[in-house]
Interface confidence: medium
Amino acid sequence: FERTRSLQDPCSNCPAGTFCDNNRNQICSPCPPNSFSSAGGQRTCDICRQCKGVFRTRKECSSTSNAECDCTPGFHCLGAGCSMCEQDCKQGQELTKKGCKDCCFGTFNDQKRGICRPWTNCSLDGKSVLVNGTKERDVVCGPSPADLSPGASSVTPPAPAREPGHSPQ
């Protein structure tokens, strides 16, 4: 690597993947193993992220970009850049402090992550329940009761209740 010749800042010409080494008269030195610099002009290289434990490597670290992690099977990512891995549950369940628990009546979860959400209240939109909700699926709202033919009935679920201590996420 050549000595940089910028009169303003001799480090400004050091490209990504290198750092401006003050100990070597501001020569552009390559990033050491397991480190990277994603922009030019850096005075240090950043340590590569290590995907350990429940994290697994999605993209290896290079001299110019950090490693990227995702989660091992049975877990899903949360947070910016997959900073957290959280256990999956089954559809119809949510993860609580005491493990995966079934959604209580009046709520559902159609994913392996997240919390049980209340069924849609069809009557708020002046509609009736066409298909009842389950632990895994929301209700399906149909036409308003007035639009139904004589003799047709609709089922309106009670206001959703949660068991005490049914903790989100």
Partner: antibody, heavy 116, light 107 residues
Framework: QMQLVQSGAEVKKPGASVKVSCKAS????????LHWVRQAPGQGLEWMGM????????NYSQTFQGRVTVTRDTATSTAYMELNSLRSEDTAVYFC?????????WGQGTLVTVSS | LLVLTQSPSVSVSPGQTARITCSGD??????AYWYQQKPGQAPVLVIY???ERPSGIPERFSGSSSGTTVTLTISGVQAADEADYYC??????????FGGGTQLTVL
């Protein structure tokens, strides 16, 4: 890159309303609740409410019930928070934030100043 | 109604251990989360689910739970740790609640 980008600062008069937007990108909008949290100058964090982008289900803090409305537009992956009947005590930074029982990502905040 | 109570301030010297507590009746059943907030910035999650640490958060941050109290421990405190720290939980109706915040001063 996951981002929550909020609308710019607002100056309002007492009694007026304010509507703050929060545009989400870099993740599946319908996979996470969007919360609104405010922070008055020198004060702590105060949760206002949330919207579930699927179905638009909302939940509000009793403190703001009847005065705040949180909505979303799934077509543009944007959430909105409207606060009515503003008073000087509503001067604060308003954050939108993503998560379920907790918040894993925050917007940059929008300063709302209420002054006559 | 879920209420979380934090002590308003904690002061420690660099290198010492800071302990910030948060108490609430629902905490034996509900997870607690901790956020760090520096002036003019949005909060940052430092501990989730009582004791888990997001990647990128230094190992000196740890969390624990005992009965109705959760504790954020910062060992080997550095000047950069000076900030406000908030605990947070959610009740059984998905209502999110924050503690009043604790100002950590590094002497």
């Amino acid at each position: 890159q996951m981002q929550l980008v909020q609308s710019g600062a607002e100056v309002k008069k007492p009694g007026a309303s304010v509507k703050v937007s929060c545009k989400a990108s870099g993740y599946t909008f319908t996979n996470y609740y969007l919360h609104w949290v405010r922070q008055a100058p020198g004060q702590g964090l105060e949760w206002m409410g949330m919207v579930n982008p699927i179905g638009g289900y909302t939940n509000y803090s009793q403190t703001f019930q009847g005065r705040v409305t949180v909505t979303r537009d799934t077509a543009t992956s944007t959430a909105y928070m409207e606060l009515n009947s503003l008073r000087s005590e509503d001067t604060a930074v308003y954050f939108c934030a993503r998560g379920f029982g907790f918040i894993d990502h925050w917007g940059q905040g929008t300063l709302v100043t209420v002054s006559s | 109604l879920l209420v979380l109570t934090q002590s308003p301030s904690v002061s420690v010297s660099p290198g010492q251990t800071a302990r910030i507590t948060c108490s609430g009746d629902a905490l034996p059943k509900q997870y607690a989360y901790w956020y760090q907030q520096k002036p003019g910035q949005a909060p940052v999650l430092v501990i989730y689910k009582d004791s888990e640490r997001p990647s990128g958060i230094p190992e000196r941050f740890s969390g624990s739970s005992s009965g109705t109290t959760v504790t954020l421990t910062i060992s080997g405190v550095q000047a950069a740790d000076e900030a406000d720290y908030y605990c947070q939980s959610a009740d059984s109706s998905d209502i999110v609640v924050f503690g009043g915040g604790t100002q950590l001063t590094v002497l």
